[in-house]
Interface confidence: low
Amino acid sequence: EEELQMIQPEKLLLVTVGKTATLHCTVTSLLPVGPVLWFRGVGPGRELIYNQKEGHFPRVTTVSDLTKRNNMDFSIRISSITPADVGTYYCVKFRKGSPENVEFKSGPGTEMALGAKPSAPVVLGPAARTTPEHTVSFTCESHGFSPRDITLKWFKNGNELSDFQTNVDPTGQSVAYSIRSTARVVLDPWDVRSQVICEVAHVTLQGDPLRGTANLSEAIRVPPTLEVTQQPMRVGNQVNVTCQVRKFYPQSLQLTWSENGNVCQRETASTLTENKDGTYNWTSWFLVNISDQRDDVVLTCQVKHDGQLAVSKRLALEVTVHQKDQSSDATP
């Protein structure tokens, strides 16, 4: 004869207020003859939750038909869950006895606890932009979850980050908890198209974590590099000078030309192109009127990027009958 086992496969069952909870209990043998009862708690003060033979339990229904002779499933459903229903529930087999039934075997118990899903994580980046090679902080917050156990991970472009600190509040018992995590991320020059992701896993999400994202494009400033060149061919008494502003982000840029220290107001031709990494290139052309008798001309391309200090690059045009090579230097 096979020994009776009382199987309650859940250690913990998370339920939501107002919903129905299913407490599983199956037996492995029909013997010994006798009823299965459900209790909350253990010892003399335990509370009877369901007795198929007697009593009135309006919120409890059975999953299977207990009147069938070969029934081995004694699972129950409790409707309209309230906070007062939390506790550990045991299905208990009784053996027929006289004058009353005798407790024979108890299941290991299922703890019923209230669960609440965490809110969608909100990720906030730094207030000001930072240049590559520097570290920026991102915060992630999620609220309103229960129980307290929660796992939070950070990713940058799919790669898990390890430099972060996480706090769950409050530390004591509460109906709901909040999590806040701060991650430190080192910016790379190619991070304009990068994302940081905060991922929150919680029992109530049943294996489907919540994610919050932030774009590093909001946190990064890639400063431009400048190059000023003179086109080798001159058209009549005009020379074409090009200022190439490369690999900058964000797009916000002011470019001015100066001729021998005087800012030029006239229109110049320019083009803006986007690189694959999300940074931009800006090319500006400046036509200089020259004559063979004219003194040397010093041209300056000055760029103010994203409200930062201006950077400039100079080009000295040495113009003779036979146009000489140009030389170039930079000033901060």
């Epitope: 096979e2 496969p9 129980p147 796992t151």
Partner: antibody, heavy 126, light 113 residues
Framework: QVQLVQSGAEVKKPGASVKVSCKAS????????INWVRQAPGQGLEWMGW????????GYAQKFQGRVTMTRDTSTSTVYMELSSLRSEDTAVYYC???????????????????WGQGTMVTVSS | DIVMTQSPDSLAVSLGERATINCKSS????????????LAWYQQKPGQPPKLLIY???IRESGVPDRFSGSGSGTDFTLTISSLQAEDVAVYYC?????????FGQGTKVEIK
């Protein structure tokens, strides 16, 4: 990396108690249940019970009920297993092991053990 | 308690050959509510703790070579090593985690022929 590090070997006299520690690192300590499994020399594996480090809830195998106590210290991410009234047949390697999923789902709450401690040899001899 | 019985107790297989270990439970480990078999397989090498290979009877743990596979349902389960390697020499255990007390098989020792 994720690991469980146990305390060192113990030699005890019959009737005494032993307390073995298991320090967790590399993961959220309170999110995974810790189980204890023992292995007598040259023998198989025997499950002793589990503990939830968050709630402190425990479940012990009937065989060890009354002799085993599992506790935890969340400030140091450490779980302890104390076995009392030791006898010679308690001589074994005692392992702590983490259940493989961070959370109980609504369908299962016992799981396989994915991370094991290195083991603690407990010798009971007069 | 659920009794787990493994066969054979020991097994000698040539390198590159298939090794098959059986595990039988005294009652079904298939839980109808989620249609999962609550069975795991572990590998234990001398002086080391066990290492999880398979859970839910057939799901390979991450990092476990794909020459290890698990099959079966209900009360009969099998661990197969498709092409035995020298590093696979160990004792293998099955374990049920349907209902406490969680129980292990007595172990199967795999050696090279």
């Amino acid at each position: 990396q994720v690991q469980l590090v146990q305390s060192g070997a113990e030699v005890k006299k019959p009737g005494a108690s032993v307390k073995v520690s298991c320090k967790a690192s590399g993961y959220t300590f309170t999110s995974y249940d810790i189980n204890w499994v023992r292995q007598a020399p040259g023998q198989g594996l025997e499950w002793m019970g589990w503990m939830n480090p968050n709630s402190g809830n425990t479940g012990y195998a009937q065989k060890f009920q009354g002799r085993v106590t599992m506790t935890r210290d969340t400030s140091t991410s450490t779980v302890y297993m104390e076995l009392s009234s030791l006898r010679s047949e308690d001589t074994a390697v005692y392992y702590c092991a983490r259940e493989s999923y961070a959370y109980c789902s609504s369908t299962s709450c016992y799981d396989a053990f994915d991370i094991w401690g290195q083991g603690t040899m407990v010798t009971v001899s007069s | 308690d659920i009794v787990m019985t493994q066969s054979p107790d020991s097994l000698a297989v040539s390198l590159g050959e298939r090794a098959t270990i059986n595990c039988k439970s005294s009652q079904s480990l298939l839980y109808s509510s989620n249609n999962k078999n609550y069975l795991a397989w572990y590998q234990q090498k001398p002086g080391q703790p066990p290492k999880l290979l398979i859970y839910w009877a057939s799901i390979r743990e991450s990092g476990v070579p794909d020459r290890f596979s698990g099959s079966g349902s209900g009360t009969d389960f099998t661990l197969t090593i498709s092409s035995l390697q020298a590093e696979d020499v160990a004792v293998y255990y099955c374990q049920q985690y349907l209902s406490p007390p969680l129980t292990f098989g007595q172990g199967t020792k795999v050696e090279i022929k």
